[in-house]
Structure formats: C-alpha cells, structure tokens
C-alpha cells in the first residue's frame, strides 16, 4: 500500500513538474526589464527563449520571434536545448511510468517488469528535473552577468553627454516556474526510485526442506535457499514452507502482481 502511494505520488508530482517545465519553456517572461533604480520608461520589455515582447503603457503588447538560429547567443541555444531535453525525457518518463503504475493492470506484466519501468521513469524524471534546473540556472547566471555589465556601462554617450540608457534585465517569472518545476520533477523521480525498491521482489531467506530417502524421519534444514531476485528476472519465487507452520499470507510479504489497491 505504501509503495503504491509512493509511486502514485511520485507520478503526480512529476506530472505537475513536467507541466511546469513545459510552461516555463513556453513563457515569454524569462527576463524582465529591471524597474528598480532605473529611469522609468512608459514601455516594459521582457524576453523569453523564443521571442521578445514590449508592452506599452496602454497595454498594447507586441512580440517578435527570434527568427534566426545562427545569430542567437550560444548560451540561449544551450538553455533551449536543456529545456527541450528535459521535456522530452519527462514526457517519455511519464509514458513509461503510466504503464509502471501498480494500480494499473496490463496483461500479465510481472512485478519485476513494473519495478524496472518504475526505476527507468524515476531516472528519467531525475534527469529531466536536472536539465530544467540547469537550463534555468544557466539563463539566470547569464542575466546576472549581463545585469552587472550593463550597470557598469549604464550611461553611455559621446563627449560626456548622456545619449542612451541601457535597459537592464532581471529574473522573470519563468525562471521561478522553471526552478520549482524542475525541483518537483526531481522529487517525483526520487519518489519513483524509492517506490521501485518496494516493488522489486526482495531477497527473502526461506527455510529449505531437505528430504532424506534412507530415513523415516523428515529433517528440516534451515537456511540455504534464496528466492531469486533481479530486475531482469521473470523467475517466480519458490515458496517453501517450514512444516506448514506459517500461512501463505505471512510468507508472501512482498507485493505481487495479484495485489490491487
């Protein structure tokens, strides 16, 4: 039950996280015009990964796409790549994790296969979350660098006469969405990995039975036999009972494909 809850929660958290990563990637407000200690302008500039926008005081907003690949900064291209990789991995992870969910019955899928898929999706979510966090952090670092550079050169001109005021950019809402979403995806992935441990058949020691043909008495030899484990194995665990002293329910302590929520 706890395993199913952990897996389900991991899936939901990851789903929210990936939705957030997609939202952040599509958002226009990755960087926004810094209004603090700046000459107040009647236009507000903000930029995303795909286009830059200008909002006039009337509310009129005009956005222009970056219709070039070669002309864009390498860092921006890297951030785009990281976010897309994060989304793709997350989407595949979601697809895999749907089939891995314990509460969903698909044919005669073994627990070990579900455990495998849960682990795979968990790793994918972790990498997806890390990609998003890395992408957002790279962009944030780029902003901080540019912010201080533009602060140093804020007033530029000829002959000491002020000609232009450089627009400084600060963190936009998309950065915070990206960080939170990446974190959620990462947490969801960790939860899936934890759930995988519970799903995987445990290495349980059972008391093996040894029969001696020569004697009339039956000797019970403890230890020795181990139930087969391993994520790739389809071998069913052999249940050997010590003199029928325990019920089948007591022995079968790990979840099987016959458990339902």
């Amino acid at each position: 039950m706890a395993v199913t809850a952990c897996q389900g929660l991991g899936f939901v958290v990851s789903l929210i996280g990936i939705a957030g990563i997609i939202a952040a990637t599509c958002m226009d407000q990755w960087s926004t015009q810094d209004l603090y200690n700046n000459p107040v302008t009647a236009v507000f500039n903000y930029q995303g990964l795909w286009r830059s926008c200008v909002r006039e005081s009337s509310g009129f907003t005009e956005c222009r796409g970056y219709f070039t690949l070669l002309g864009l900064p390498a860092m921006l291209q890297a951030v785009r790549a990281l976010m897309i990789v994060g989304i793709v991995l997350g989407a595949i992870g979601l697809l895999v994790s749907i089939f891995a969910l314990k509460c969903i019955r698909i044919g005669s899928m073994e627990d070990s296969a579900k455990a495998n898929m849960t682990l795979t999706s968990g790793i994918m979510f972790i990498v997806s979350g890390l990609c998003a966090i890395a992408g957002v952090s790279v962009f944030a670092n780029m902003l901080v660098t540019n912010f201080w550079m533009s602060t140093a050169n804020m007033y530029t001109g000829m002959g000491g006469m002020v000609q232009t005021v450089q627009t400084r950019y600060t963190f936009g809402a998309a950065l915070f969405v990206g960080w939170v979403a990446g974190g959620l995806t990462l947490i969801g992935g960790v939860m899936m990995c934890i759930a995988c441990r519970g799903l995987a058949p445990e290495e349980t020691n059972y008391k093996a039975v040894s029969y001696h043909a020569s004697g009339h008495s039956v000797a019970y030899k403890p230890g020795g036999f181990k139930a087969s484990t391993g994520f790739g194995s389809n071998t069913k665990n052999k249940k050997i009972y010590d003199g029928g002293a325990r019920t089948e329910d007591e022995v079968q302590s790990y979840p099987s494909k016959h458990d339902y929520v």
Epitope: T41, A42, S57, S58, R64, T167
Partner: antibody, heavy 120, light 113 residues
C-alpha cells in the same frame, strides 16, 4: 465617435481650488488612460498627469504632485482634475486627452481645453 | 527629465514649398526591445487642441495627408511637409513618449509669407 468634452472656463482667486471635468463618450472609458496637459499662453505643452479609470492608477509629473489630484467616475465616464492652492503661474489652458491603444504611448483624442485664469 | 529641443522655433514659408523641422531629445527614445522610437508629433492650429500626426516617430496616424513624413531615430527626428498647404499653418510639437514624465518640445510655428 470618440469625444472628450471639457468643462467651461474658470476664473479663480489665488490660493483657491478648481475642479476641471472631462466627459468622454464613444469608447470604453475604463480601458484607456486619460492624460491632462497644461499649455500656458503662447507657450509649449506640459504633461501633468494621467489616470487609468479602470483601476484608478495614476502617474504624476513630480512637478505637479500636490498640485493636481485626479479622480475618475466610471458611471458617468468622466475624469476630473482638481488643482489646489492656485498661483498666477497656474493660469493656463488644460487639455484632457486619451492615450491610444498601440499608438506608441501617444494621445490620439483631445478635449477642447479648459481655460483657468488665476486672478485677484 | 528628458529635454526636447525643437528647431527652428518658427518658419515662414510659401505654398507648395518643402518644409523640414527638427526635434532633438537629450536621451535616445529608441527601445531596443522592438526597435521603435517613442517620439510623437502633434499639429496644433490656433484655438484648437493638438492633433496626433505621427507616433513611433514615423507611423502616420489615419487621416493625416501623405505629404507629411516623420523620420529619424535615437535622439534626432525630423518632420517633413513635402508641399505646404495653407491649412498646414500651425504649431508642430514633438513629444517624448518613452520616459516619464512625458515631455514636449517648445514647438515650431509654421507661418505663411
């Protein structure tokens, strides 16, 4: 069609207050900024203040902070500007105007102007 | 505040003549985000309120005759009337529509000989 109709001329004593009105029609009053611009006799234009009637947000030219107070009545689609502690230099024609949407923060429609004369 | 300087302060012309007036701002009115100049031109006839001619320095307001042309970028702007008509006699104002507070130039008065 869009119209901005301003109240009639005012003759006031120094130190007194005056409230100018600007009644709008032909558009959604709450969706556009209303500006007030001052023009002294034979001189250039001077931007005073603006108000967004939808929210009541205002931006003042620091020079007029404490001098001008803006209000807007949504029910009658009318903007008001009260000028207080009037001095001789406040004598001017005051125009109200509407900021156009998608027109580079420019004022596309103007009222006919209200003449304010401060005299003892 | 941004200082807007218009030149000349007055112009005496004859009908059909080409007229050019200038407007200079103390700071660039070019917004890097959309590459637009936030400069507005108004025409004010005697006893009337100003009338919008150009916004974004060169975008003509509807109803404005095409003999009027707005140009320039950054800090230097020009209003040109290709062939002056009697009805063009007015004061022409340029306005900084980028920085608060909005500021206007002193105006250029267009007169007939």
């Amino acid at each position: 069609q869009v119209q901005l109709k301003q109240s009639g001329p005012e003759l006031v004593r120094p130190g007194a207050s005056v409230k100018l009105s600007c009644k709008t029609s032909g558009y959604i009053f709450t969706n556009y900024w209303i500006h007030w611009v001052k023009q002294r006799s034979g001189q250039g234009l001077e931007w005073v203040v603006r108000i967004y009637p939808g929210t009541g947000n205002t931006y003042y030219n620091e020079k007029f902070t404490g001098k001008a107070t803006l209000t807007a009545d949504k029910s009658s689609s009318t903007a008001y500007m009260q000028l207080s502690s009037l001095k001789y230099e406040d004598s001017a024609v005051y125009f109200c105007s509407r900021e156009g949407y998608g027109k580079g923060n420019s004022m596309d429609y103007w009222g006919q102007g209200t003449s304010v004369t401060v005299s003892s | 505040d941004i200082v807007m300087t218009q030149s000349p302060s007055s112009l005496t012309v004859t009908a059909g003549e080409k007229v050019t007036m200038n407007c200079k701002s103390s700071q660039s009115l070019l917004n890097a985000g959309n590459q637009k100049n936030y400069l507005t031109w108004y025409q004010q006839k005697p006893g009337q309120p100003p009338k919008l001619l150009f916004y974004w320095a060169s975008t003509r307001e509807s109803g404005v005759p095409d003999r009027f042309t707005g140009s320039g970028s950054g800090t230097d702007f020009t209003l040109t009337i290709s062939s002056v008509q009697a009805e063009d006699l007015a004061v022409y104002h340029c306005q900084n529509a980028y920085y608060y507070p909005y500021t206007f130039g002193g105006g250029t008065k267009l007169e007939m000989k």
